[in-house]
Interface confidence: low
């Protein structure tokens, strides 16, 4: 007869490891007992358990509660055991020694490999601001055994750099994602992707990018100066800008206080029926935590009577 086992058994941390050991014997042969031991190089054998054909399973005190037989139905020639809740310290060489009748003893070795899946963490970098040079957007760290793979999934253009630290039973991998911040990156996802043989699927951590910026300010409403004449109702100036965080707006008049009746409504300056006292230089001040911008315009309220008077003069002059 002969023993059937595996060269390597791979299990994820916390799962149960099945250590296979099956005696394929000739008809009439019987297995008397199966002894399992841990046999790491340089250390003496440490007994795990004894599977006896008559007395059943005996587990050594060091492994009490952690070694079991596979659930029934069981083949009397099957000496496999389950090692419950595998931990990293269980990684190593194991030996099953099978005593048969009448063929004698057989032994086989296997290596138990315990995969430690990573628990990745993503740390955003410093606040991103438009105008910065190459800046750290985020770093992603994952520690496991064996070393995990850390990559990035994003449509944002950037550069990555990785470094690895080896520990006694695991390795930590850190990958950094650097980019040159621009407003188009706002709200874009940056996903750290961690691959590892102990994971059924890649682990993904998504960070949403926030880039502070403030666009130049401009004022709309004066496109047609002829509309700004005495008596006109509903005249307004609108300040145009955009930013992250969203900006606030403030209106002032450069050559004095805002005239009475002029309404400030956020980015809009609303005028009552126009008079000449509304002529002046108006300033829109836009600001957010990142920056501030100004835009100024000159309002010149026309007097239609003056204009028509001039026309009469011109006619009479000719």
């Amino acid at each position: 007869g002969e023993l059937e086992t595996s060269d390597v058994v791979t299990v994820v941390l916390g799962q149960d490891a099945k250590l296979p050991c099956f005696y394929r014997g000739d008809s009439g042969e019987q297995v008397g007992q199966v002894a399992w031991a841990r046999v790491d190089a340089g250390e003496g054998a440490q007994e795990l358990a004894l599977l006896h054909s008559k007395y059943g399973l005996h587990v050594s005190p060091a492994y009490e509660g952690r070694v079991e037989q596979p659930p029934p139905p069981r083949n009397p020639l099957d000496g496999s055991v389950l090692l419950r809740n595998a931990v990293q310290a269980d990684e190593g060489e194991y030996e099953c020694r099978v005593s048969t009748f009448p063929a004698g003893s057989f032994q086989a070795r296997l290596r138990l490999r315990v995969l430690v899946p990573p628990l990745p963490s993503l740390n955003p970098g410093p606040a991103l601001e438009e105008g910065q040079g190459l800046t750290l957007a985020a770093s992603c760290t994952a520690e496991g055994s064996p070393a995990p793979s850390v990559t990035w999934d994003t449509e944002v253009k950037g550069t990555t750099s990785s470094r690895s630290f080896k520990h006694s039973r695991s390795a930590a991998v850190t990958s950094e994602f650097h980019l040159v911040p621009s407003r188009s990156m706002n709200g874009q996802p940056l996903t750290c992707v961690v691959s590892h043989p102990g994971l059924l699927q890649d682990q993904r951590i998504t960070h949403i990018l926030h880039v502070s910026f403030l666009a130049e300010a401009s004022v709309r409403g004066l496109e047609d100066q002829n509309l700004w004449h005495i008596g006109r109702e509903g005249a307004m100036l609108k300040c145009l800008s955009e930013g992250q965080p969203p900006p606030s707006y403030n209106w002032t008049r450069l050559d004095g206080p805002l005239p009475s009746g002029v309404r400030v409504d956020g980015d809009t300056l609303g005028f009552p029926p126009l008079t000449t006292e509304h002529s002046g230089i108006y300033v829109c001040h836009v600001s957010n935590e990142f920056s501030s911008r100004d835009s100024q315009v000159t309002v010149d309220v026309l007097d239609p009577q003056e204009d028509s008077g001039k026309q009469v003069d011109l006619v009479s002059a000719s």
Partner: antibody, heavy 122, light 107 residues
Framework: EVQLVESGGGLVQPGGSLRLSCAAS????????MSWVRQAPGKGLEWVSR????????DYADSVKGRFTISRDNSKNTLYLQMNSLRAEDTAVYYC???????????????WGQGTLVTVSS | DIQMTQSPSSLSASVGDRVTITCRAS??????LAWYQQKPGKAPKLLIY???SLQSGVPSRFSGSGSGTDFTLTISSLQPEDFATYYC?????????FGQGTKVEIK
């Protein structure tokens, strides 16, 4: 398939205590943050507490802070909620739920238990 | 705490209808928003995460959109099994908070 099964609910008097358990199966329990969420009869969902995968970090809703304690035993694949100084307003179905596997922030919850009813009444 | 306001609180619709539920946050939460479906006597089920990502196994008739403070859950063609209560939830800050729910009933 991940399964979460809550137990430990029941009728308790105001000021009393109760310990809820949530047994997990089908995945690596110790790799995930877990939360308790409750739902008063006929009302909406209210987040109660959360514990990180290794139990180092715990958060609570203001309404239960100082009275409830969340804990976990990864070796037993079990989440707990110790509820002390119970009040009538704690009456609810209590759900345990697992934080989504692929994000480290936040509390969007991809697997939920069937819930256990806690009734606080004299 | 961030307040989440859903509208409407209930609606009646027929099979095949397009249904839209909105959720507004009391402050900007980027895309840290999830949508859940709950049927009577059952636990909630995650439909959408990160505002617009469809959870594995959820039918493609469900979709989410929005960012910042205003979010939408859309069911493109209502099916009999979709009659339920829907909740939005922010997880931008602790504590995470839920909307008050929208009950979708048969017309």
């Amino acid at each position: 398939e991940v399964q979460l099964v809550e137990s430990g609910g029941g009728l308790v008097q105001p000021g009393g205590s109760l310990r809820l358990s949530c047994a997990a199966s089908g995945d690596i329990f110790g790799s995930y943050a877990m939360s308790w969420v409750r739902q008063a009869p006929g009302k909406g969902l209210e987040w109660v507490s959360r514990i990180s995968s290794h139990g180092a970090s715990r958060d609570y809703a203001d309404s239960v802070k100082g009275r409830f304690t969340i804990s976990r035993d990864n070796s037993k694949n079990t989440l707990y909620l110790q509820m002390n100084s119970l009040r009538a307003e704690d009456t609810a179905v209590y759900y345990c739920a697992r934080q989504t596997e692929d994000r480290s922030y936040g509390y969007d919850l991809d697997y939920w238990g069937q819930g256990t009813l806690v009734t606080v009444s004299s | 705490d961030i307040q989440m306001t859903q509208s409407p609180s209930s609606l009646s619709a027929s099979v095949g209808d397009r249904v839209t539920i909105t959720c507004r946050a009391s402050q900007g939460i980027s895309s840290y928003l999830a949508w859940y479906q709950q049927k009577p006597g059952k636990a909630p089920k995650l439909l959408i995460y990160a505002a617009s990502s469809l959870q594995s196994g959820v039918p493609s008739r469900f979709s989410g959109s929005g960012s910042g403070t205003d979010f939408t859950l859309t069911i493109s063609s209502l099916q009999p099994e979709d009659f339920a209560t829907y909740y939005c939830q922010q997880h931008y800050t602790t504590p995470p908070t839920f909307g008050q729910g929208t009950k979708v009933e048969i017309k």
